[in-house]
Amino acid sequence: QSSERRVVAHMPGDIIIGALFSVHHQPTVDKVHERKCGAVREQYGIQRVEAMLHTLERINSDPTLLPNITLGCEIRDSCWHSAVALEQSIEFIRDSLISSEEEEGLVRCVDGSSSSFRSKKPIVGVIGPGSSSVAIQVQNLLQLFNIPQIAYSATSMDLSDKTLFKYFMRVVPSDAQQARAMVDIVKRYNWTYVSAVHTEGNYGESGMEAFKDMSAKEGICIAHSYKIYSNAGEQSFDKLLKKLTSHLPKARVVACFCEGMTVRGLLMAMRRLGLAGEFLLLGSDGWADRYDVTDGYQREAVGGITIKLQSPDVKWFDDYYLKLRPETNHRNPWFQEFWQHRFQCRLEGFPQENSKYNKTCDSSLTLKTHHVQDSKMGFVINAIYSMAYGLHNMQMSLCPGYAGLCDAMKPIDGRKLLESLMKTNFTGVSGDMILFDENGDSPGRYEIMNFKEMGKDYFDYINVGSWDNGELKMDDDEVWSKKSNIIRSVCSEPCEKGQIKVIRKGEVSCCWTCTPCKENEYVFDEYTCKACQLGSWPTDDLTGCDLIPVQYLRWGDPEPDYKDDDDK
C-alpha cells in the first residue's frame, strides 16, 4: 500500500456516501515520506468496511427509510494517517467538483462538443475517519466544499468548536467527558501522584490537557508528563519507560490518554526492560477492551483500568460477517489480502502475496476462529444510519409527498443536509437514543474495564464499572481482591501527629517532608507550627495551647532542679 496506487471499495446508488476507514496500519516512521501503509487491520479496517457495505444493504431494503432511494458508497483507506487521508479526501472532492461542473454543463470535450461521459456521482457526506488528528485534517478540507462529516470514534474536544469545524458531527462524546471519568477514578482510589503519558496528536494532547486541568482542581499532582507517537521506534518507548521508572515507587499509576498502539508500544517496552507489574496503567478509550493492544503482552497489561465507550456488540453484524469467504466476497477489494494476513496463508491466484506465505489457505478456514467484534462497531453503524436519517428528513422536507429524489435534491446541498443532520434523532443500533447537541456531539456513557488474569495464562477484560453523565460507579471488590491490594500512588505519606508538611522548593504540592514542631509549638495548620504564648504549653494532641497552671512553692517543698545552659 504505497502512495502510487490506492484501492477503493464502491457500491452503486442514487446517493453516494464517502467513508474513511483505517484498512491498514499507519506508515512506520521510515515509510511516512512515501505514505506506505502498514499491515491490514481487521477490527478497525475490514470489519468497518463490511459494516458499511452491509448497513447500506439493510437501509436500502428498509421500506420506511429513504423509500425509492438507493444509498451507495465509496470507501477509502485512511491508514490512520493524515497525509494518506487527505490524499483520499481530495479524491472525494475531485469527484464532487467534476460532478457539479457536469450539472452546470461545464464539462466539454476538447473539440468543443458537449460530453456524454458521466463521471462518478458526488459524495454527499463522509463517514469517519477514526483518528481525531486525521479527522481534523479531513474536516478542514471537507468544510470548504460544504460536505458534512460524521465521525464514529474521533473524540477530541477541539472538534466541538463549530467556528472551526462547522461540518463535523459525531455519534460519540467529546473527550472532556472521559478525561473527567479518568480523574474520578484517580480520586476514588486516593491516587494523588501519577505519571501522565499521551499520544502525540490531537486526541492525546487535548485529552491529556483536560485531564491535567481537572486533576489540578482536584489536588492530584502529575509527577511528569510525557508524549510519544504511536509509530515511534522501540528506542523511544524504552526511553519513555525508563523516565516513568524514575518516578517509582511514588507514581505507580500512569494515566495514558493514548491511542491503542501507543499503549501496545509501552507494554512491549515493559517486556524488554523487565518492568511487568511495576505500573498500573489507566487508559483512555483508545485502549478500551482491544485485544490487538494486549495480544502477546498480557502479563504487562494486567491490572490496567480502561475507559470504553458504551457500545454493546451488534449481533446482526456478526451473523453477516462470519459467513464471508474470499472466493465469494469480491466487493471488498481488501478482503483477500486480509484473509491471507489473518490466516497466514496464500490464496491461489494472488501472486503478490506468494513471497509472504508458504502454505496455501485451507478451504475450511472460517472467521469464526478467534473472532472479536470491533468495539466501536455500534458507533460505525450509528454514524451510517445518522447520514441515512439526515437524508431521509431532508427528502421529506424538500420533496413532500414524493418518493425518491426530487429536483430540489439535485444536487444535494451540503448546507441543508448539515441542518437536517443536526436535527436528526433516532434509536441507535443498541437501543439508545442518537442525537446531536449544538456542537454536533453525542452524550457520554462509558464502561470501566479492568484487564485481569482470570486463570493460568488466561487473561480478559471485565466490566468493573460505569461513568454516566458525571456519575462514577465502581465494583471495587472486582478490581481489588482485598482492600490492602489497592495500589498506592502518592508522593508523600501523611505526617504524624505534631508534624507539619514542608514542601521543598520547586516540588509539587503533593510532595513534602514531615517536620516536627518545636517543644513549645502546636500545629496551627498542616504547613505551620506556631509558638504558644508565654505561660501556655501545647496540648497533648498538639492542636492548641493550654495555660500552664501556676504552682506556688511552699516551705518544705523540695528544691527545684536547675539546668545549666550547657546542659542539653
Partner: antibody, heavy 117, light 110 residues
C-alpha cells in the same frame, strides 16, 4: 547510607546457604537491590535483582537455584545445591532506581562463600 | 540474550598515557552503559553511568562515550592509582540475561 553482606562461610557441596544484606539510611521500597558475585581471580557475575516492589529477575544460569527476598531492612539470597563453582565473594549492590536494571551506586564489601568437600 | 563483550582483556599503559577500553552490546541498549573500577580486595566503584555521565567524585580524566551497541571508556593522563580492573555493565534489562557485566579489562600502569 550503607549496605553490608553477611552469612558467607565454608560449606560442603549440596548444602543450602542464605546470605543477608542489611541496609541502613534508605528504604528498600525506593531502590532495587542486586546480588553480584566474583570468583577468586575472575570477573563480576550478576546473579539477580529484587525491585522495590518485590519483583525478582535472575540471570538465566541462576534461575531455580538462587532466590532473593526482602524485609524492610534486609535482602536475603537463598542458595541451594551449591557446588565448588559457587565459591566466590558475594556482593550486594543498590541500584539507582526502584525497578529495572540501571547502575549500581552503593556496594557492600562482600561476603566470602567457600564450597569445598 | 543480551551480552556485553569487553575488549581488551588486559592493557599496559605508561603513566600520563591514554587507555581506551571498548564494550560491545549484542543489541541496542541506547545509552544505558555504565563503567566500574575495581581494585584488588575492594568492591567495584561506579565511574560512568548512562554512557557518558561522570559519577560524583570521579576525576574528569575518565570519559565515557558511545551509544546503541558500541561504548568506550577512555582514561587520559593515566596515574598509578588508575591501575585496576574495569568493567562495563548494561543498564537496559534484567530479563533473560546471563550477565549484565562485560568480562573486565585489567589496566596495568608502568
Amino acid at each position: 547510607q550503607s549496605v553490608e553482606e553477611s552469612g558467607g562461610r565454608l560449606v560442603t557441596p549440596g548444602t543450602p546457604l542464605t546470605l543477608t544484606c542489611t541496609v541502613s539510611g534508605f528504604s528498600l521500597n525506593n531502590y532495587a537491590m542486586n546480588w553480584i558475585r566474583q570468583a577468586p581471580g575472575k570477573g563480576l557475575e550478576w546473579i539477580g535483582i529484587i525491585y522495590g516492589s518485590g519483583s525478582t529477575y535472575y540471570a538465566s544460569w541462576a534461575k531455580g537455584r538462587f532466590t532473593a527476598s526482602k524485609t524492610s531492612t534486609t535482602v536475603d539470597l537463598k542458595m541451594t545445591s551449591l557446588t565448588t563453582e559457587d565459591t566466590a565473594t558475594y556482593f550486594c549492590a543498590r541500584d539507582e532506581l526502584a525497578a529495572g536494571i540501571n547502575y549500581f551506586t552503593l556496594w557492600g564489601q562482600g561476603t566470602l562463600v567457600t564450597v569445598s568437600s | 540474550a543480551l551480552v556485553m563483550t569487553q575488549t581488551p582483556a588486559s592493557v599496559e599503559v605508561a603513566v600520563g598515557g591514554t587507555v581506551t577500553i571498548k564494550c560491545q552490546a549484542s543489541q541496542n541498549i541506547i545509552d544505558w552503559c555504565s563503567w566500574y573500577q575495581q581494585k584488588l580486595g575492594q568492591p567495584p566503584k561506579l565511574l560512568i553511568y548512562e554512557a557518558s555521565k561522570l559519577a560524583s567524585g570521579v576525576p574528569s580524566r575518565f570519559k565515557g562515550s558511545g551509544s546503541g551497541t558500541q561504548f568506550t571508556l577512555t582514561i587520559s593522563g593515566v596515574e598509578c592509582a588508575d591501575a585496576a580492573t574495569y568493567y562495563c555493565q548494561q543498564g537496559y534489562s534484567p530479563s533473560g540475561v546471563d550477565n549484565v557485566f562485560g568480562g573486565g579489562t585489567e589496566v596495568v600502569v608502568k
